[in-house]
Amino acid sequence: LQPGAEVPVVWAQEGAPAQLPCSPTIPLQDLSLLRRAGVTWQHQPDSGPPAAAPGHPLAPGPHPAAPSSWGPRPRRYTVLSVGPGGLRSGRLPLQPRVQLDERGRQRGDFSLWLRPARRADAGEYRAAVHLRDRALSCRLRLRLGQASMTASPPGSLRASDWVILNCSFSRPDRPASVHWFRNRGQGRVPVRESPHHHLAESFLFLPQVSPMDSGPWGCILTYRDGFNVSIMYNLTVLG
């Protein structure tokens, strides 16, 4: 969409499950009728490079009221449609990856799950919910990011070497919080500031490593909208 006309943004990690939330406010008298509810999820993929604009799949072609330098809108398609009898239709190869939680649907939660989310899933999503006597909709934009942890210097380390671990996710805003941990046999052990561990935003500096530091290190990035991502890195320290 052109600037000034945005829908709520949902972030997801490539390769991880993603929830596209849709829980519209449903009047109490309609809650008992949710078994007959139908929902259709539509996806408008993000624009590609400029090319000849494809036509509208059903109606005459729409044109974005945006600068001509923008790429055309790729064709919108139905991701998943669940009719009143629970009949489903959708588009392959997406379909095996997309799910609606049946129990959630009967509670008025029409969220779409992508298991896993892929880069091509980015774009605008619209859900149309048909109840017995009213129609409701949900709209959102799915953005996908890649998570990574890098070590500097990379590769295997020797005892008493230093290393900086950098935890990152390809999202423009900064995380609200960064938590570091180590995976031990008994679970996650938080990494706290100490002479051996220096924490600075998304960086962890180990001034002198030892073979005891070998193994998985992890970080959790949490953003203001509640989205969080967990990233692991396997550190190798040679004796």
């Epitope: 000034g4 006309a5 059903l58 909709s137």
Partner: antibody, heavy 120, light 107 residues
């Protein structure tokens, strides 16, 4: 070209009935949700009723619920509005409209309208 | 029901002027707003849908913007054929509702 043509309007007494028809051409009628929208003389637009492409879901404005019935005949490419127990406030031009999608509820094609006058 | 309030109810302008019509929804409709143009004795015509997308064949001087509850239709340079009444409509949830209209008149 894509066209909607309404018919069946006219003068009717309060409490009377009228059936509006809409003949569609130039597009695959069965693939589209359809709607009726009305406009009282000198007033704004008011959505009246809606039917999905498959006819699974039908909705009415509160002002007409229980009195009006929308139906469609895909074999005849036609949309209908049966109006019973008509009131003076139902006086309006009634437009047959095509809904852009079953899931995107704006109206991309309109008929020329048919005038319904309810008066004694 | 979602109420749509348009302003102004009428506006006088000259050919070549830039005109802005606003529409306010009584609750969040994300970007589900359409704009229509109606000339006397004629059916309305769709101009803009989903807040900012021009419909087929609509001249580029018409543009829409907004999200949430506040929406705008802008005509960048008025042409003689643009003098008409304009309506906004929310297409977020039923019952689908329209603004009361803005009459654009020649000054």
């Amino acid at each position: 070209q894509v066209q909607l043509v309404e018919s069946g309007g006219g003068l009717v007494k309060p409490g009377g009935s009228l059936r509006l028809s809409c003949a569609a051409s130039g597009f695959t009628f069965s693939s589209y949700a359809m709607s009726w929208i009305r406009q009282a003389p000198g007033k704004g637009l008011e959505w009246v009723s809606y039917v999905t492409s498959g006819g699974d879901y039908i909705y009415y404005a509160d002002t007409v619920k229980g009195r009006f019935t929308i139906s469609r005949d895909d074999a005849k490419n036609s949309l209908y509005l049966q109006m019973n127990s008509l009131r003076a406030e139902d006086t309006a031009v009634y437009y047959c409209t095509r809904v852009a999608y079953d899931y995107e509820w704006y109206f991309d094609v309109w008929g020329q309208g048919t005038l319904v006058t309810v008066s004694s | 029901d979602i109420q749509m309030t348009q302003s102004p109810s009428s506006v006088s302008a000259s050919v070549g002027d830039r005109v802005t019509i606003t529409c306010k929804a009584s609750q969040d409709v994300t970007t589900a707003v359409a704009w229509y143009q109606q000339k006397p004795g004629k059916a309305p015509k769709l101009l803009i849908y989903s807040a900012s997308y021009r419909y087929t064949g609509v001249p580029s001087r018409f543009s829409g913007s907004g999200s949430g509850t506040d929406f705008t239709l802008t005509i960048s340079s008025l042409q003689p054929e643009d003098f008409a009444t304009y309506y906004c409509q929310q297409h977020d949830s039923s019952p689908w509702t329209f603004g009361q209209g803005t009459k654009l008149e020649i000054k």
